[in-house]
Interface confidence: medium
């Protein structure tokens, strides 16, 4: 089946906007907007630090680490209030992602 221009293949995502704010010392705030064409039972999420279609149950229960949102070699840690997750790099640097 051929895709029309601008049409996404089922189960895929693309980044449509990205913004970085490095005005605060030792802290960079990055916002990313993605467009996804998810299959039934899936919802837009993050896998290996990229937008991806993930099992909708993960989102419903806020089991964010089950999406495998961190890069290979990083450790995923759920924020206690379930508002997001942290990815800890081998060197100890922590990246926090919150879901809004």
């Amino acid at each position: 089946q051929f895709l029309k221009e601008g049409q996404l293949a089922a189960g895929t995502c693309e980044v449509i906007a990205a913004h970085r704010d490095s005005s605060q010392p030792r802290r960079t705030i990055a916002r990313q907007t993605a467009r996804c064409a998810c299959r039934k039972g899936q919802i837009a999420g993050t896998t290996r630090a990229r937008p991806a279609c993930v099992d909708a149950r993960i989102i419903k229960t806020k089991q964010w680490c089950d999406m495998l949102p961190c890069l290979e070699g990083e450790g995923c840690d759920l924020l206690i209030n379930r508002s997001g997750w942290t990815c800890t790099q081998p060197g100890g640097r922590i990246k926090t992602t919150t879901v809004s």
Partner: antibody, heavy 122, light 110 residues
Framework: AVTLDESGGGLQTPGGALSLVCKAS????????MGWVRQAPGKGLEWVGV????????SYGSAVKGRATISRDNGQSTVRLQLNNLRAEDTGTYFC???????????????WGHGTEVIVSS | ALTQPSSVSANPGETVKITCSGG??????YGWYQQKSPSSAPLTVI????KRPSDIPSRFSGSKSGSTHTLTITGVQAEDEAVYFC??????????????FGAGTTLTVL
């Protein structure tokens, strides 16, 4: 086998502070969130608080919020509960608990310590 | 919080069901914890709705229907006599997600 060994309990004075330590073994400690649950004499289980894997994030039950601090040392495989401004109602057995997955809730505890008894009395 | 019956009783070999309802986080499931005496540590018999630790006999199972969770002991034995607590999570704007437990159900094996 997973073991959680609590220590630091005993007789405490009202208004004082206590520090409980849980030493873990038998699993990769840094891969699991940990928590504390307590039980007053003859009563049910009460949530004290939890800490995430890295130690950067904590949450506390309403009865101890503002008085409790949970910390962890992944190198030593220990988790510590500090409780200040002790009250008689803090009397009970304090259990260390391990989460079964990437987080700990009252539904996902898969291992418990033997407990350490705390008595707050003048 | 969580509601569970205060006591249940059964003869050896019978099937026992203990229910637990309420809680603010049914998506996160329920856990069941056995305590044989007030001075002993709890033992996890079911976590995350239906997962059973490897050292727990297969006669223990968990199931969920709506907001009610049920612990089933198929072919109850004398050593199963204990207090069973269910656990779940509740949410408050003050404390966020906080664990909650039922008051406990005393199982007597006749």
């Amino acid at each position: 086998a997973v073991t959680l060994d609590e220590s630091g309990g005993g007789l405490q004075t009202p208004g004082g502070a206590l520090s409980l330590v849980c030493k873990a073994s038998g699993f990769t400690f840094s891969s699991y969130q940990m928590g504390w649950v307590r039980q007053a004499p003859g009563k049910g289980l009460e949530w004290v608080g939890v800490i995430n894997k890295s130690g950067s994030d904590t949450s506390y039950g309403s009865a101890v919020k503002g008085r409790a601090t949970i910390s962890r040392d992944n190198g030593q495989s220990t988790v510590r509960l500090q409780l200040n401004n002790l009250r008689a109602e803090d009397t009970g057995t304090y259990f260390c608990a391990k989460g079964s997955a990437s987080y700990i809730t009252a539904a996902t505890i898969d291992a418990w310590g033997h407990g350490t008894e705390v008595i707050v009395s003048s | 919080a969580l509601t569970q019956p205060s006591s249940v009783s059964a003869n050896p070999g019978e099937t026992v069901k203990i229910t637990c309802s309420g809680g603010g986080s049914s998506g996160y499931g329920y856990g069941w914890y056995q305590q044989k005496s007030p001075s002993s540590a709890p033992l996890t018999v079911i976590y995350w709705n239906d997962k059973r630790p490897s050292d727990i006999p297969s006669r223990f199972s968990g199931s969920k229907s709506g907001s009610t969770h049920t612990l089933t002991i198929t072919g109850v034995q004398a050593e199963d006599e204990a207090v069973y607590f269910c656990g779940n999570d509740d949410y408050s704007s003050d404390s966020g997600y906080v664990g909650v437990f039922g008051a406990g159900t005393t199982l007597t094996v006749l």
